[in-house]
């Protein structure tokens, strides 16, 4: 899915209002320095691509995130604010329902959610330049200038 045409500010609002709190709940009791952040993103569409991948794609050692509250709210936000997103997810959702039987919090899942927090932080506060400024470092953001 190409996240270029999402309403980034509405997704940001959904994150700050609810999703972030669910991520904090999931990570409660974990030190912020416990995991090294190895996943990064360069602009808002790229951040959403990485967020979708980490949230919904099963990985070795962590196959259960899609059923978490933050994941369901993420899915809802993307479905509402990214045109055509929900249609692309129908097959993936059916596959997830078959794959996930129970919610298990593993250390690998905690590490993955720590990565997610970093991606969301980057998505929310990209260092966009002032209007009228021409010193963009990132061409993708040049065409999607949503102020924080």
């Amino acid at each position: 899915y190409d996240f270029t045409n999402c309403d980034f500010e509405k997704i940001k609002a959904a994150y700050l209002s609810t999703i972030s709190k669910d991520l904090i709940t999931y990570m409660s009791g974990t030190k912020s320095t416990e995991f090294n952040n190895t996943v990064s993103c360069s602009n808002r569409p790229h951040c959403l691509t990485e967020i979708q991948s980490l949230t919904f794609n099963p990985t070795a050692g962590c196959a259960s995130l899609a059923k978490e509250m933050f994941a369901m709210k993420t899915k809802a936000a993307l479905a509402i604010w990214c045109p055509g997103y929900s249609e692309t997810q129908i097959n993936a959702t059916q596959a997830m329902k078959k794959a996930r039987k129970s919610k298990v919090t593993t250390n690998k899942c905690l590490e993955q959610v720590s990565q997610l927090q970093g991606l969301w932080r980057r998505f929310n506060r990209p260092l966009l330049k002032q209007q009228g400024s021409s010193d963009y470092k990132d061409d993708d953001d040049k065409h999607h200038h949503h102020h924080h």
Partner: antibody, heavy 120, light 111 residues
């Protein structure tokens, strides 16, 4: 403990440059926007700019864009602000600050400040 | 640039009384239903400390005598019962649009 430790006070001549450092510890430096703020005597706070250590991307207040340069050294978790062509109006306390955990945009951790005095 | 104007510039309030500081933005700092306005407290020789984020949310470890309200262009910081340790300069800050801008500051003293 999450903290930012800045370099010591500097006295500089007009026309020269100063480079202030800000060493981060207790958090994953590369994933937080780092900001610089000026506080001149008897004045309010003024945002200079910000840098994302993950890729070195910067955003500047146009007022400082020509004279301020923000850089980072990820290997030492240190942010730098260099100010060139110094003049008396640059006499101030300069703070580095970390943006919050969640992308709210507030500054939740501040350095102790570095006093820069520009005098002939 | 969004200009933040605080009023009053200075304020003297008796201990235990209510203190109110206003901040007006030259244009709205709201986005998608959220107000991107923060309040800081700065004491002499110290860096600023976050008090209120996003107009009305209390910062971590901040006493509940502090509160914030407002949306759009008009915002208020209230201290319900002034304590001696609240003597400081208070700043509002908008982060909705670059460049990030602060108010000129309000100096709060004890009457």
């Amino acid at each position: 403990e999450v903290q930012l430790v800045q370099s010591g006070a500097e006295v500089k001549k007009p026309g020269s440059s100063v480079k202030v450092s800000c060493k981060a510890s207790g958090f994953t430096f590369s994933t937080y926007n780092m900001h610089w703020v000026k506080h001149a005597p008897g004045q309010g706070l003024e945002w200079i700019g910000a840098i994302y250590p993950g890729n070195g991307e910067t955003s500047y207040n146009q007022k400082f864009k020509d004279r301020a340069t923000l850089t980072v050294d990820k290997s030492t978790s240190t942010a730098y602000m260099e100010l060139s062509s110094l003049r008396s109006e640059d006499t101030a306390v300069y703070y580095c600050a970390r943006e919050d955990d969640y992308g709210e945009g507030y500054f939740d951790v501040w350095g102790q400040g570095t006093t820069v005095t520009v005098s002939s | 640039d969004i200009v933040m104007t605080q009023s009053p510039d200075s304020l003297a309030v008796s201990l235990g009384e209510r203190a109110t500081i206003n901040c007006r933005a030259s244009e709205s700092v709201d986005n998608s239903g959220l107000s991107f306005m923060h309040w800081y407290q700065q004491k002499p020789g110290q860096p600023p400390k976050l008090l209120i984020y996003r107009a009305s949310n209390l910062g971590s470890g901040v006493p509940d005598r502090f509160s914030g309200s407002g949306s759009g262009t008009d915002f208020t910081l209230t201290i319900s019962s002034l304590q001696a340790e609240d003597v400081a300069v208070y700043y509002c800050q908008q982060i909705n649009t670059d460049p990030l801008t602060f108010g000129q500051g309000t100096k709060l003293e004890i009457k």
